[in-house]
Interface confidence: low
């Protein structure tokens, strides 16, 4: 039975040209995390594999930095980065958990810096 839950940074906003950290936290399960995928709608941004480490998709390598923790840092944000982001936790023996984050990239200087959670 899948008992875990994913906490995310939720709906967040950031300034155009700035940076933001996307963060998910899997709790309430003793399952082992084998891999975390970060996806933007239908595109793979990055993979963090427990054995192989990080892989950033070539088309994003200049604007995506791994971490902190299992999170993902997006840099040099553009308005086109607005949209849904998904953290997909592959675990054993539970299976797959998915968290959703909505990022809005704003022109103004009043954008919120999103919350994030520490990965133990």
């Amino acid at each position: 039975m899948m008992t875990g839950t994913i906490e995310t940074t939720g709906n967040i906003s950031a300034e155009k040209g700035g940076s933001i950290i996307l963060q998910c936290h899997l709790s309430s399960t003793t399952a082992q995390v084998t891999q975390v995928n970060w996806e933007q709608q239908d595109q793979l941004l990055a993979i963090c594999n427990a054995d192989l480490g990080w892989h950033i998709s070539p088309s994003f390598k200049d604007r995506v930095a791994p971490g902190p923790g299992l999170g993902l840092t997006l840099q040099s944000l553009t308005v086109n980065d607005t949209g849904e982001y998904f953290c997909i936790y592959h675990t054993y023996p539970d299976g797959t958990y998915t968290g959703r984050i909505f990022l809005e990239v704003l022109e103004s200087s009043v954008a919120e810096h999103g919350a994030r959670f520490q990965i133990p």
Epitope: I20, I21, P66, P68, T73, V110, H113, R116
Partner: antibody, heavy 116, light 107 residues
Framework: QVQLQQPGAELVKPGASVKMSCKAS????????INWVKQRPGQGLEWIGD????????NYNGEFKSKATLTLDTSSSTAYMQLSSLTSEDSAVYYC?????????WGAGTTVTVSS | DILLTQSPAILSVSPGERVSFSCRAS??????IQWYQQRTNGSPRLLIK???ESISGIPSRFSGSGSGTDFTLSINSVESEDIADYYC?????????FGGGTKLEIK
């Protein structure tokens, strides 16, 4: 303009506790993380932890988990750090700073002196 | 924790010279590095974020470079007001950590 205001100094006795403040102004307090950083005389900088005023989430450096407690009063846009069971090792300047990963605004620091 | 090692501990340069500060991380951290200046009895001031991104209000003579484990802060023409301690800081893993600092002196 964006500012973080801290009291200049605190003199406390060994074994006691101290609670210092960091009052924010010039921006939306609930939108930015507040960090706390320690600097002993003549030494470098140590990150203690941070707190997100929008949701009250905290993260601590393991070395300070039993020493520091971070709290908020969002009604007055003020962050607090309490240090407990003080010793001479806790004598330092404590800065609050704003930011997520990088710290773009800093307070002037509170000098804590632990002395009997 | 990620260890940041700054070298040298002290740099001594003449006004107008170019100077470079080194920061080495104990593991690869992408470009998750910041640089701060701290003048005597002052608070730290953010100079560079995410390795090379400039900060509003910071003179253009300050620049950052590097990725992975090796990072550099450069001042292309040192002025007397640049006398200070310089610290790197990583935001790749918690806890955030700082380097030990490099003191800039003017000859």
């Amino acid at each position: 303009q964006v500012q973080l205001q801290q009291p200049g100094a605190e003199l406390v006795k060994p074994g006691a506790s101290v609670k210092m403040s960091c009052k924010a102004s010039g921006y939306t307090f609930t939108s930015f993380w507040i960090n706390w950083v320690k600097q002993r005389p003549g030494q470098g900088l140590e990150w203690i932890g941070d707190i997100y005023p929008g949701r009250g989430i905290t993260n601590y450096n393991g070395e300070f988990k039993s020493k520091a407690t971070l709290t908020l009063d969002t009604s007055s846009s003020t962050a607090y750090m309490q240090l407990s069971s003080l010793t001479s090792e806790d004598s330092a300047v404590y800065y609050c700073s704003r930011g997520l990963g990088y710290f773009d605004v800093w307070g002037a620091g509170t000098t804590v002196t632990v002395s009997s | 924790d990620i260890l940041l090692t700054q070298s040298p501990a002290i740099l001594s340069v003449s006004p107008g010279e170019r100077v470079s500060f080194s920061c080495r991380a104990s593991q690869s951290i992408g470009t998750s590095i910041q640089w701060y200046q701290q003048r005597t009895n002052g608070s730290p001031r953010l100079l560079i974020k995410y390795g090379s991104e400039s900060i509003s209000g910071i003179p253009s003579r300050f620049s950052g470079s590097g990725s992975g484990t090796d990072f550099t802060l450069s001042i292309n023409s040192v002025e007397s007001e640049d006398i200070a301690d310089y610290y790197c800081q990583q935001s790749y893993r918690w806890p955030y950590t700082f380097g030990g600092g490099t003191k800039l002196e003017i000859k």
